[in-house]
Interface confidence: low
């Protein structure tokens, strides 16, 4: 199945050129998407190419600039946020990245009514998080780990919390592990729908062990970075949830929301908060052993000014075959009755599907079903539910948007996107306006990405928002590789793979093979998306075949495949890559003396174990920022899949699944090990231990470190990294430079 859209080739073949590494490093063939910043049912904001903030009204067809690029430039603003009453805009500048989602910034408030910045009671700097209330123009912000409230931008702030302390107590923002592994946000506060209440989390990291590493910088002495970071089995953060009435914040102060008794009996996590109404909130909790999740619906008791979470409104989700949920436990989408909700969880056949919960989880009504998975619920209105799935034509790596009519009985289902641009678009996401009056579809491929605007009632396309015409023109004279997505059936396991083939691919010839692997639990690499990246270059210019394989542990193909790796990381993921390689060799066009594997992060772990598998299949391989022992990685992630590193739990497999334990097996492969010294996520410790084990075993290997670089190896390091890896592979495959 060739997924690239066919292009009319220029009759003069010599005008076509291969991709170069420079193309990739310069981002020459990057694409744009268009996500409207919705501000009502029919209006959205968008930052124009010349940096004006423009308001578009779909129904009148009119647009006007609400904030000029001159105003933006006056404070060097890189981002903005309009207050819901449209009186003020916050302007964000001095962006300073912290971890994956978190950053600090300076904020200025601009008054649209008089065209001036608000003077007096200016915001402190740098601020860790700031947001408007959902109605009006109240502001909540976090500064130095404490939460502050302003009724109006020019008012003095009301301080809500006082115990915030760097690396100790976090209010309204997550600590490292909650940010990376649980919430996946930079914030931990949530306004109620009309702005009456503000809920927030407090994380106490006082007893958490600290990871310390050197940051070399330019000074005479390196700085030491200290992060409270719970590794597997270590002491975890203690979380509490509070809610404060923002109208009268001083009246009773923050009220703690009770934790369900069955959760509070042992170590636990808070996983998400969803407001239902101004006086009803839904909290999700998770046991430290992450196979039991409790969803708790709590109501405000006016007489006591407290939050009550009756046991009758506790819903338990439990997995008997793995962990609860997919990567995270799914969040509920409430219906208009403010008590029933829609939620994705495993059905009886082990596929993640949408269920409707009215009273108890046991009586849940299954809304979708089949040997495919519902992936995201975008919006529930009074008569429709919009969701994405990989049902269409049985390709797990696709995403289409569906509408289920819940207003009629029996409900009917319609695929909104399946036939829109079938060859070009098979992987969609969507963004909905209020009440789903309109929505934007963003197609990521396999053809060139395109973003379109649609009527929420009829699904009619209204206009193209971004079609990447410049990219299309730039690619006209490029010899792109061919891509196929197919599957292998092996021992009752389906292994989907994507193969990237050189432009002049000839089945009768032999090609070097590079396996690109990630393979982490609940991940998916084989997706019908557009990309012109390093591996595209390796196929186009260097004549390599590149393959990506989704083996056991990967997502969206049912629990049997997903939970196969439960408590056994590092076994089946590796086996399945090896099995696929053997199948590729059988296809006849792979030079079995020139096979390599590479991966980053979890992929670095898998590639290292594959190289050390003793199969003799791989000539060489690369591990970038690999995990080397699960005892070195974060508790929340690791224990979800591995349990605890204790004798009476799973210590034995923690010890057996390290890269270091297989040091001897690297003797017959060429291994390139790469890591950033300031990696806050997968600590440099992981590669240091691999290197030490290889040295102790007297095994030769190559290595590269990137000073002061984190897990992303960004900036100039990226160029150096890909240049270095290219040389390594070309040498391994005996390709001339």
């Amino acid at each position: 199945i060739v997924l690239r859209p066919s292009r009319v080739h220029n009759s003069e073949e010599n005008t076509m050129r291969a991709l170069t590494l420079k193309d990739i490093l310069n981002g020459t063939f990057s694409y744009k998407t268009f996500f409207p910043n919705w501000i009502s049912g029919q209006e959205y904001l968008h930052q124009s190419a010349d940096n004006n903030i423009v308001l578009y009204n779909i129904e009148t067809g009119q647009s006007y600039t609400i904030l000029s690029n001159r105003t933006m430039k006056s404070v060097n603003a890189s981002n903005y946020g309009l207050s819901p009453d449209r009186q003020f805009v916050y302007l964000e500048s001095d962006y300073s990245k912290l971890w994956r989602y978190s950053y600090t910034a300076t904020y200025y408030i601009y008054d649209l009514s008089n065209g001036e910045f608000v003077r007096g009671n200016e915001l402190p700097r740098p601020i860790q998080y700031l947001c408007w209330s959902p109605v009006g123009s109240k502001l909540a912000y976090v500064y130095q780990n404490n939460i502050y409230l302003k009724q109006r931008p020019g008012d003095p702030p009301f301080q809500i919390t006082f115990n915030g302390r760097e690396n100790k107590i976090f209010n309204g923002i997550p600590d490292w592990v909650y940010e990376e592994e649980m919430l996946a946000t930079k914030y931990a506060l949530w306004w109620s729908p009309n702005g009456k209440f503000l809920a927030y989390a407090e994380f106490n990291d006082t007893d958490i062990p600290v990871i310390a590493y050197s940051y070399y910088g330019d000074e005479q002495y390196p700085r030491t970075i200290n992060i409270p970071y719970p590794k597997a089995g270590a002491k975890n953060p203690v979380v509490r949830i509070f809610i404060i009435d923002t109208t009268y914040p001083a009246y009773v102060g923050p009220q703690e929301v009770p934790v369900p008794a069955m959760i509070a009996s042992s170590d636990y996590y808070f996983s998400w908060l969803t407001w239902v109404t101004d006086e009803r909130v839904c909290l999700q909790w998770l046991k430290r052993v992450q196979n039991v999740s409790v969803l708790s619906i709590c109501d405000f008791r006016e007489d006591w000014q407290t939050w009550d979470c009756p046991k009758t409104q506790e819903h338990i989700e439990e997995s008997r075959t793995g962990w609860a949920g997919g990567f995270f436990v799914s969040t509920p989408v409430f219906s208009y009755d403010a008590i029933s909700y829609y939620k994705i969880f495993s059905d009886k056949d082990g596929y993640k599907h949408i269920h409707y919960i009215k009273d108890t989880v046991e009586n849940a009504i299954q809304i979708t079903s089949g040997k495919w998975e519902a992936i995201n619920i975008f919006r529930v209105t009074q008569d429709s539910l919009f969701y994405s799935s990989n049902e269409f034509e049985e390709y797990p790596g696709r995403r289409n948007i569906y509408r289920i009519s819940i207003g009629s009985y029996p409900p009917s289902k319609k695929c909104v996107t399946c036939h829109l641009r079938k060859e070009r678009c098979q992987y969609y996401t969507a963004s909905f306006s209020d009440y789903a009056k309109y929505y934007a579809l963003v197609c990521y491929g396999p053809g060139i990405p395109i973003s379109t605007l649609h009527d929420g009632r009829t699904d009619q396309e209204i206009k193209i928002l971004e079609e990447n015409k410049e990219l299309e023109n730039a690619l006209k004279n490029i010899q792109l590789p061919k891509e196929e997505i197919k599957k292998l059936e092996v021992d009752e396991i389906t292994l989907w793979y994507k193969m990237i083939l050189p432009p002049q691919f000839d089945r009768s010839k032999k090609y070097p093979l590079l396996i690109q692997v990630y393979g982490g639990p609940c991940s998916q690499s084989v997706r019908s998306v557009f990309a012109v990246n390093w591996i595209s270059y390796l196929a186009s210019k260097e004549g390599m075949v590149i393959a990506l394989v989704d083996g056991r542990g990967t997502a969206f193909q049912g629990d049997k495949l997903l939970y196969a790796v439960y408590r056994k990381l590092g076994v089946y993921e590796v086996e399945d890559q090896i099995t696929a390689v053997r199948k590729f060799i059988e296809m006849g066009f792979i030079d079995e003396k020139r096979i390599a594997i590479w991966g980053w992060s979890y992929g670095g772990y898998v590639s290292s174990l594959a190289l050390a598998s003793g199969t003799g299949l791989f000539k060489c391989g690369i591990a970038v920022a690999p995990v080397s022992s699960w005892e070195y990685y974060a508790s929340v992630y690791t224990e979800r899949f591995m349990g605890l590193p204790t004798k009476d739990d799973n210590l034995e497999h923690y010890k057996n699944s390290t890269v270091m334990a297989r040091a001897e097996y690297f003797r017959n492969v060429d291994y390139l090990l790469i890591h950033g010294t300031a990696d806050d996520n997968v600590h440099f410790q992981n590669s240091a231990q691999i290197a030490k084990a290889l040295v102790n075993a007297q095994v030769d290997f190559q290595a590269m470190w990137y000073s002061d670089q984190n897990h992303g190896l960004s900036g100039l390091s990226t160029n150096h990294l890909y240049t270095h890896m290219t040389h390594f592979l070309k040498q391994c495959f005996s390709l001339s430079d």
Partner: nanobody
Framework: QVQLQESGGGLVEAEGSLRLSCAAS????????MGWFRQAPGLERELVAA???????YYADSVKGRFTISRDNARNTVYLQTNSLKPEDTAVYYC?????????????????WGQGTQVTVSS
């Protein structure tokens, strides 16, 4: 949309057997969960047996070991083989269908129904 038509009911002596059939018309039969319910005079309609689209089966405790549910997707038909029948098995037997899982015992969770077929077990 799926339409259902039951057949195979009748009068049988205790310890006897019957094979009930339910023919479905409409598209995508294989994607529906199918169930057999029964309703005796003056009693609630109760789930007897159900089978998911993937072939997983569920039985009420009162019929376990005696009744067997099966499906033939090629023929768009679901069967209920009833053995060792007892007088208390006397009821109108209804075929039902739903999109989704099969482990749902409440009548409200099954949107599609047949007309029913009478099974009478004499002592």
């Amino acid at each position: 949309q799926v339409q259902l038509q039951e057949s195979g009911g009748g009068l049988v002596e205790a310890e006897g057997s019957l094979r009930l059939s339910c023919a479905a018309s409409g598209r995508a039969f294989g994607s529906y969960a199918m169930g057999w319910f029964r309703q005796a005079p003056g009693l609630e309609r109760e789930l007897v047996a159900a089978i998911s689209s993937g072939g997983t089966t569920y039985y009420a405790d009162s019929v376990k070991g005696r009744f067997t549910i099966s499906r033939d997707n090629a023929r768009n038909t679901v069967y209920l083989q009833t053995n060792s029948l007892k007088p208390e098995d006397t009821a109108v037997y209804y075929c039902a269908a739903r999109t989704g899982g099969a482990a749902y015992t409440r009548r409200i969770d099954w949107p599609y129904w047949g007309q029913g077929t009478q099974v009478t077990v004499s002592s």
